[in-house]
Amino acid sequence: GCLTQLYENAFFRGGDVASMYTPNAQYCQMRCTFHPRCLLFSFLPASSINDMEKRFGCFLKDSVTGTLPKVHRTGAVSGHSLKQCGHQISACHRDIYKGVDMRGVNFNVSKVSSVEECQKRCTSNIRCQFFSYATQTFHKAEYRNNCLLKYSPGGTPTAIKVLSNVESGFSLKPCALSEIGCHMNIFQHLAFSDVDVARVLTPDAFVCRTICTYHPNCLFFTFYTNVWKIESQRNVCLLKTSESGTPSSSTPQENTISGYSLLTCKRTLPEPCHSKIYPGVDFGGEELNVTFVKGVNVCQETCTKMIRCQFFTYSLLPEDCKEEKCKCFLRLSMDGSPTRIAYGTQGSSGYSLRLCNTGDNSVCTTKTSTR
Amino acid sequence: IVGGTNSSWGEWPWQVSLQVKLTAQRHLCGGSLIGHQWVLTAAHCFDGLPLQDVWRIYSGILNLSDITKDTPFSQIKEIIIHQNYKVSEGNHDIALIKLQAPLNYTEFQKPICLPSKGDTSTIYTNCWVTGWGFSKEKGEIQNILQKVNIPLVTNEECQKRYQDYKITQRMVCAGYKEGGKDACKGDSGGPLVCKHNGMWRLVGITSWGEGCARREQPGVYTKVAEYMDWILEKTQSSDGKAQMQSPA
């Protein structure tokens, strides 16, 4: 289920799957929510530790049991991923952090009159992931009112420093507030060039596009279909970026599909989950559990309820069935995508709906002069 | 909202505008989306007005002037007014609206979390009131959704300021000693939300006050935590499964 409570002065021991710098526990929790394997997190605010390297440290953790031992650590904040938390799942993070400089690659500097305007500029720049703004009272006069637009390889700051009269924050593109707009078109038989930032296996171009949308550095993608001439590249989804923000070239290519991230869409973003079920397809991955269930939809529900499950295969092979129930293979991988996609099998595959934000957890777990 | 500022898109995605279309159409109250098909508001919003037919509920909007005849709206399937609410009394000023069709959640339209039942231990220090109501006592409905940061006031302090009225444990008050920032007419039914541990919770429903933003006259809100049993009971679906779960 959904667990929203935070544990003050507590740190989860072990289970690390990733670490990064984040300005607060809530942003750390959001990164945990969107990480394919993270179930728990621990965050070290600046006040909690003397080690400059670990200040603002966000540690993403996994556990086979879903829990880890807590150790007392003054100032630390720990908690759970919000996977399975329905409408609370959002990559949107509006907070502005005063007295904090989030470091990264500074690719644009301009003078603006307020931190809100700086955030707006970041939101309206295709490459900007976060920003820092030097206020009117910054100690160096020449830097006052400077708005620095930034990015980093992982989408989070490469370092976070306490610095007076500096305010930092993140792009509001995940809030569907970008003024850039987006390309909804999917281009059949076209391959985009430029830099690959990641490679995953997906059953179709739409899953590829959603993964691109929620990847911090993906601006566009090319997907190689299951009939692509090179067998080892079938169902490969290449997540891409470029200096300009658009593909520098595209090549006509049979059995490829290309498109753009939808992160810059105005007013509506795709859900960060994939609800379609793929008949005749087998998703390979690390086995989490095998259970007998009645029907593929129940298999998907079972996967969704088991928080570590990322995807599943429901087998209809006679040897995998007894009476009306068949085997439901619950699986996971390092990146949340299948490690192998096979066609022509007797069965169906699909993904966990744990990141769907339309879940029915409508409310969180945890007279005189009338107006 | 008196002394407030403009909100931005998606900042308060649970805020809805309850509008009435008799001869003309007008905004009357705020409300809070608490589920795909449920809105929580104040009972007094329905005083003197028909139930169901004439109401239009707009969600996922920021600027009332953007509403046209083509703007989608929700209609009411059922209005559940608290059984102990009495017109012109401040007590039990709470009502649930069941929408005719469930709403999809987006970044601009999603529910607010409800507090734990009888939540008394949490100390809320970051509370906001939002609405399209008057910006002064004899004002007019605002176009852009307004927001204002207001501190909670203890019930003891609030009772001192309202000696002619009974401030019950099922009410919560918010305001500045010096006044200047408050909810006002047209904000009724809307949310008083507080951010705690990074999560927004619906602490109050805008209900009443002496004038608006007057010195030493805090706003009085229906305390949502005190009505959790009622909310959960009324939002049970026909198959007995709760449409929403209260915090553990």
Partner: antibody, heavy 122, light 106 residues
């Protein structure tokens, strides 16, 4: 066009009863708060009672509380005033009016009937 | 249940501005409506929500309300404006009328 037509007035003895009716047309009756206002001969207007659109809430002036009952039948577009224990001081022209009411703007009556005379005398 | 007080009579010369007052405790906090009633006729709404005019009412009629007094003003008064005028307010479920003012156009 909004029309309100009162009926049921007449001469009645003190302590007697009378039922006034108000037939409404030209608007969606079930959407509006309805009100009775009276005017004694040569005197000013005095509010008597009003009723919410659904009939779920009713309000009375102190002078008639416990003696008069307001009601409505939305299927017949009709408003009623049942008057019991009538007194000489209840003698007046009784007007039925359509009320515009909400908690923001309060109450006012934008359409009035022609009135029906009630005389309480022995 | 506070009372609303109006002067019994107001006289005005044709073409002049007539001002009829209505006073009550904290009346400025409430919204006031004004009704015109000519002999033998039903009352007619001329001002609502302090200052608003129904579409059929001429612009000569205006209203204001602050502190403890609401005022109905009729500019360029004409003979046909001669009537009784009533103020009305709403307070905690109670409808309150003023005692009425007879406007005489001299």
């Amino acid at each position: 066009e909004v029309q309100l037509l009162e009926s049921g007035g007449g001469l009645v003895q003190p302590g007697g009863s009378l039922r006034l009716s108000c037939a409404a047309s030209g608007f969606t009756f079930s959407w509006y708060t309805m009100v009775w206002v009276r005017q004694a001969p040569g005197k000013g207007l005095e509010w008597v009672s009003y009723i919410y659109p659904s009939g779920g809430a009713t309000f009375y002036a102190d002078s008639v509380k416990g003696r008069f009952t307001i009601s409505r039948d939305n299927s017949k577009n009709t408003l009623y005033l049942q008057m019991n224990s009538l007194r000489a001081e209840d003698t007046a022209v009784y007007y039925c009016a359509m009320g515009s009411y909400d908690y923001i703007w309060g109450f006012y009556s934008d359409h009035w009937g022609q009135g029906t005379l009630v005389t309480v005398s022995s | 249940q506070s009372a609303l007080t109006q002067p019994p009579t107001v006289s005005v010369s044709p073409g002049q501005t007539a001002r009829i007052t209505c006073s009550g405790n904290k009346l400025g906090d409430k919204y006031v409506a004004w009704y015109q009633q000519k002999p033998g006729q039903s009352p007619m709404l001329v001002i609502y929500q302090d200052t608003k005019r129904p579409s059929a009412i001429p612009e000569r009629f205006s209203g204001s309300n602050s502190a403890n007094t609401a005022t109905l003003s009729i500019s360029g008064t004409q003979a046909l404006d001669e009537a009784d005028y009533y103020c009305q307010a709403w307070d905690s479920s109670i409808v309150i009328f003023g005692g009425g003012t007879r406007l005489t156009v001299l």
